[in-house]
């Protein structure tokens, strides 16, 4: 629970508690913003980001955005609040422990995004269908 000596200031979004009343501590994420990447046509890639940050707010999760256009490939790694859209998309998979890439519709480029909620989980980004629950075969296995 929140210790009584830790003041809970008005509108304080820095103190977040879980269902047990324990204070939620922020997670660690890779945070290199946008960098050029060599990750292409692979089942998974490492971010090659050497910066691990303490997310500013405890509710933030790790996010990775992979983009490919005619000129280059970039990988973006950040912390972000899942209550807010990122690149105009909702972070649907924010509770996942792994960063499973999902394709999003963006004109003029190939755009994949993932989010996750374990320490440095956006260091390993996964494109492989075997991890993706939008795969009907996998859903069949899960529900059998």
């Amino acid at each position: 629970t929140i210790p009584p000596h830790v003041q809970k200031s008005v509108n304080n979004d820095m103190i977040v508690t879980d269902n047990n009343g324990a204070v939620k501590f922020p997670q660690l994420c890779k945070f290199c913003d946008v960098r050029f990447s060599t990750c292409d046509n692979q089942k998974s890639c490492m971010s090659n980001c050497s910066i691990t940050s303490i997310c500013e707010k405890p509710q933030e999760v790790c996010v990775a955005v992979w983009r490919k256009n005619d000129e280059n490939i970039t990988l973006e790694t950040v912390c972000h609040d899942p209550k807010l859209p990122y690149h105009d998309f909702i972070l649907e998979d924010a509770a996942s422990p792994k960063c499973i890439m999902k394709e999003k519709k963006k004109p003029g480029e190939t755009f994949f995004m993932c989010s996750c909620s374990s320490d440095e989980c956006n260091d390993n980004i996964i494109f492989s269908e075997e991890y993706n629950t939008s795969n009907p075969d996998l859903l069949l296995v899960i529900f059998q």
């Epitope: 879980d18 047990n20 324990a22 204070v23 501590f25 660690l28 303490i54």
Partner: nanobody, 119 residues
């Protein structure tokens, strides 16, 4: 009973240094990550630094990177925060904290120690 007791706070001039200590008891100190968290007057919590159980992995908020150093001595059950090049905006109550983990769903906090940076 779990106890975290901070010490080392005080009044210091801008550019000066302080070393905070946190003595832990009542739990297996060496088996979990530890944090320094601060709260400036009338502000929310700021998560300053985190250290892994072996002391090998350390993490810092951008606001203190290059100025603060977190360390621990598991043989003495003590956590430290070396604060250099202090600024007025570092003025806050500094708390030593242990976050929830897979072995313990609870978070533990010290009573805090006040650091005032002023000329």
């Amino acid at each position: 009973e779990v106890q975290l007791l901070e010490s080392g706070g005080g009044l210091v001039q801008p550019g000066g240094s302080l070393r905070l200590s946190c003595a832990a008891s009542g739990f297996t100190f060496a088996q979990g990550d530890m944090w320094w968290v601060r709260q400036a007057p009338g502000k929310g919590l700021e998560w300053v630094s985190r250290i892994g159980m072996d002391g090998d992995k350390t993490y810092y908020a951008d606001s203190v990177k290059g100025r603060f150093t977190i360390s621990r001595d598991n043989s003495k059950n003590t956590l430290y925060l070396q604060m250099n090049s202090l600024r007025a905006e570092d003025t806050a109550v500094y708390y030593c904290a242990k976050g929830p983990s897979s072995t313990s769903p609870f978070d533990y906090w010290g009573q805090g120690t006040l650091v005032t940076v002023s000329s």
